[in-house]
Interface confidence: low
Amino acid sequence: QTSVFPPEVILPRGGSVKVNCSASCDQPISLGMETPLPKKEILPGGNNWKMYELSNVQEDSQPMCYSNCPDGQSSAKTLLTVYWTPERVELAPLPPWQPVGKNLTLRCQVEGGAPRANLTVMLLRGEKELSRQSAVGEPAEVTTTVPVGRDDHGANFSCRTELDLRPYVLKLFENTSAPHQLQTFDLPATPPQLVSPQVLEVDTQGTVVCSLDGLFPVSEAQVSLALGDQKLNPTITYGNNSLSAKASVKVTAEEEGTQQLLCGVMLGNQTQETRQTVTIYSFPAPNVNLTKPEVSEGTEVIVECEAHPRAKVMLNGVPAQPPGPRAQFLLKATPEDNGRSFSCSATLEVAGQLVHKNQTRELRVLYGPRLDEKDCPGNWTWPENSQQTPMCQAWGNPLPQLKCLKDGTFPLPIGQSVTVTRDLEGTYLCQARSTRGEVTREVTVNVLSPRYE
């Protein structure tokens, strides 16, 4: 009978082991070991035993001890099991973005490692074990499917191998892959809400607001706002799970007509879009024309209002007859018309909405100069020593200059409060002069003396 000790050994790859071979008889004819491994006999041995050192053990092996005793030949094997940790533990790349509510498949490849019977592969979320499987195949590939929620955003997933040799060498060897961080997102099925003017005038500024609720993570959402080919530059305000993008838009004459306003909210690898039609229109203010803006009294003046061909106008509140883009009327200029405003209001229908524009012109009427009895009385009688204010108002456009002189030298203090004296008495020549000419009027001042009792 041949004996071997130890009958079983578990050792690291490349390691060494001492094995004792012994025979049951005291003086065996032969005693040795058969193995492809590098071996060295450790001397001195005994009469019926030998010790061998086996080195650089790279793979499982069964060295055989043999002995030849007088009662016959026999052999015994020792079982060498080599262990080594995996060389590659790799978690397959995660999708750049994972929709919330959709299952995620985690996949791990493990290359190398032995003994495979003691090697398990775990898929982890942080330190929480999601799945534990045996390593089968080369490379071993394990998969598991997990549901994804909002709380998985930013979570680290990894793959870990465990080589459990605790029954043999009281050791547990672990290898962990580089962690992969998951980015989850939740984009609602509802399109964004878009608030914008339905009509927009060329060269004016409008405001567009696009908003969407139920986004996660809202900070990663991107908003694209465009009117036709014009990309808008919105200011984005973020709420808890919502965003609002506000942009100013200015349109040019080139964009006149119907344009598409587009708001797109992009999150993860998905987009929600809303489109709206905006009508861009050009509507200049109407023209108010006077045959002449400055005329002499008595002159006939034509007032004309003209607007956009599709507009309807009102001139001084009176609609054009028939309704249309032109209106006019004729007037004979009077002094009362000086400074009079002629207002034209134009209304245009754009995409079912009425838009308005106004224009005003003022008429200047040249008249005078005038000196009337009403405004410059020809006779004043005042008690001596009383306080009086001589009044004489000249009228005209342009406004005339007024002088009242007695004997060509003594002025009447028009508009000033004076004490009536004898010197004030007399006839004054009042002269009103403008670029249009001059008029004169005589004004007599009588002074009443007090009665002496």
Epitope: E87, R88, V89, E90, A92, P93, E111, S177, A178
Partner: antibody, heavy 118, light 111 residues
């Protein structure tokens, strides 16, 4: 962090040649290291790699023709019995740490030219 | 034997244009695929790994997509500095199956 290959030279067919990749700025006990070659005017050809723990792996075509080994700061590629077809620039490159992404080569040396000619 | 086939072998495009390079694996490698850029006289440079993830410091003009057996590298707003040869590489499985294998390369010429 850098890699530099050396040892490239003119060698006669059947001779033996060892290329060395010297690393600095990181530890070879944490990274897998690969050898890749490129014949003049041709594409890249993956030869093999050595793991953080020192195990070497070879592409099927390279088995028996190349030996990869390492010390604490160098990785060697031994070309046994080269032929004219082994004329190429040989690059060493670093993979991921601790076995992860072994073949994703994010740090390369400038390469060393080996010419096999009689 | 496992193979990565790149098409086309050469492509020419103008500055500002777009180039698309395809890489086909002879068997599924999920998304274990990298892309490299190599300029004459220089070592390759990692552009993309995990089929679509940009390596650090790489311009967002480079975009990788695909999984399984069909992969694409798209270079948009082409610049003269993009003139180079581009290689795809598998990192699925062991080295004796598909690990480490490179595609044949695509030369990009910028006019």
């Amino acid at each position: 962090q850098s890699l530099e290959e050396s040892g490239g030279r003119l060698v006669t067919p059947g001779g033996s040649l060892t290329l060395t990749c010297t690393v600095s700025g990181f530890s070879l006990s944490s990274y897998g290291m690969s050898w890749v070659r490129q014949a003049p005017g041709k594409g890249l050809e993956y030869i093999g790699w050595i793991s953080f723990s020192g195990s070497a792996y070879y592409a099927n075509w390279a088995k028996g023709r190349f030996t990869i080994s390492k010390t604490s700061t160098t990785v060697d590629l031994k070309i046994t019995s080269p032929t004219t077809e082994d004329t190429a620039t040989y690059f060493c490159a670093r993979g991921g740490d601790y076995g992860g992404s072994t073949y994703i080569l994010n740090l390369w040396g400038p390469g060393t030219l080996v010419t096999v000619s009689s | 034997a496992f193979e990565l086939t790149q098409t086309p072998s050469s492509v020419e495009a103008a500055v500002g244009g777009t180039v698309t390079i395809k890489c086909q694996a002879s068997e599924s490698i999920n998304s274990y695929l990298s892309w490299y850029q190599q300029k004459p006289g220089q070592p390759p440079k990692l552009l993309i790994y995990a089929a679509s993830t940009l390596a650090s410091g790489v311009s967002s003009r480079f975009k990788g997509s695909g999984s399984g057996t069909e992969f694409t590298l798209t270079i948009s707003d082409l610049e003269s500095a993009d003139a180079a040869t581009y290689y795809c590489q598998s990192y699925s499985g062991t080295i004796s199956t598909s690990g480490g294998a490179f595609g044949g390369g695509t030369e990009v010429v910028v006019k």
